[in-house]
Amino acid sequence: TMAIWRSNSGSNTLENGYFLSRNKENHSQPTQSSLEDSVTPTKAVKTTGVLSSPCPPNWIIYEKSCYLFSMSLNSWDGSKRQCWQLGSNLLKIDSSNELGFIVKQVSSQPDNSFWIGLSRPQTEVPWLWEDGSTFSSNLFQIRTTATQENPSPNCVWIHVSVIYDQLCSVPSYSICEKKFSM
């Protein structure tokens, strides 16, 4: 079964500052959670207006997933829990098409990095997606930020078109993903 979210545009508009936006459009008030007050709008298909959608308001649809680009700063673990509260998970990149879509989105925010759902307990143990699936470096390489001062960057974020490891405690933005099935 598929959840259908309905939203009515124009009932409430957000004050400037709720979104880091490339334009000054008004967006419908998110009704799902206060966590959704901090999302990045995009030119991609958004679930605003009167429509039936498999995604909640202000999430972006791409192929078979909904994406939320959260603009609240959090550690990796805090970001993971934030996504969980919204019934989703931190981003899992499954294909080169999806990677291209994500890069296109985050490249419009060149000053910001976004946590994704890849972590490990320590450097001797392989990277693991949040759902427990294995990471394959065939899809992308993780560029290390390890130094003598910070030897254990065990979480992963994306910055513009590059994916880096990073200390899990560093506050950053994040990308939540909610897969749907038709």
Epitope: D77, P121, Q122, E124, V125, P126, L128, E130, D131, G132, S133, T134, S136
Partner: antibody, heavy 118, light 107 residues
């Protein structure tokens, strides 16, 4: 739904080898590590190692190095555990388990009892 | 290897009781800890992963907490089907290791 089905019970003599199979269904076999865990009668759980079904890479607990082999056949979504040079204290139930979040074991086979006795 | 210890080794309790089991790691493991329930003759069942995340389908009376070296599994109101043995497991470093188990039986 995710299912792991293991091969049946085995009785082996000391010094012999045993090969246990674990057939997966309900998910993409190559996406998740398969772990092997054993439990001696009345005892606790002991992690033996894992295999990455996609690459075939393995990681074995040091205790079993030299007499353990984990393999897989992706065409039939099946993982195998082979333990050689069996001793009486290898008598145990052997479980396969599929990896889940944070390297936990979210789905388990029903277990295979291997009895080593002369 | 990281050693995992559990206390108590066994506990007698009644239906409706609140039961707490502790697990201690010999070195810090952050939140890379899971809890399992096992009944005689059955495979273990995952209850908690990542120290505090409830596995899908597991009743909310089960909860986990802790980080570093000290962890707790709590059953808020024990039900008849909860009488079993509980194991913790660390996934911070190889080899992954389990605690010796805590048996919860009927008082």
């Amino acid at each position: 739904q995710v299912q792991l089905v293991q091969s049946g019970a085995e009785v082996k003599k000391p010094g012999a080898s045993v090969k246990v199979s674990c057939k997966s269904s309900g998910y993409t076999f190559t996406d998740y590590y398969i772990h092997w865990v054993r439990q001696a009668p009345g005892q606790g759980l002991e992690w033996m190692g894992w295999i990455n079904p996609n690459s075939g890479d393995t990681n074995y607990a040091q205790k079993f190095q030299g007499r353990i082999t984990m393999t897989r056949d992706t065409s039939i979504s099946t993982a195998y555990l082979e333990l050689s040079r069996l001793r009486s204290d290898d008598t145990a139930v052997f479980y396969c388990a599929r990896n889940s979040g944070s390297y936990s074991f979210g789905y388990w086979g029903q277990g295979t009892l291997v009895t080593v006795s002369s | 290897d990281i050693q995992m210890t559990q206390s108590p080794s066994s506990v007698s309790a009644s239906v409706g009781d609140r039961v707490t089991i502790t697990c201690r790691a010999s070195q810090g493991i952050s939140s890379w800890l899971a809890w399992y329930q096992q009944k005689p003759g059955k495979a273990p069942k995952l209850l908690i992963f990542g120290a505090s995340s409830l596995q899908s389908g597991v009743p909310s009376r089960f909860s986990g907490s802790g980080s570093g070296t000290d962890f707790t599994l709590t059953v808020s109101s024990l039900q008849p089907e909860d009488f079993a043995t509980y194991y913790c497991q660390q996934a911070f470093s190889f080899p992954f290791t389990f605690g010796p188990g805590t048996k919860v039986d009927i008082e």
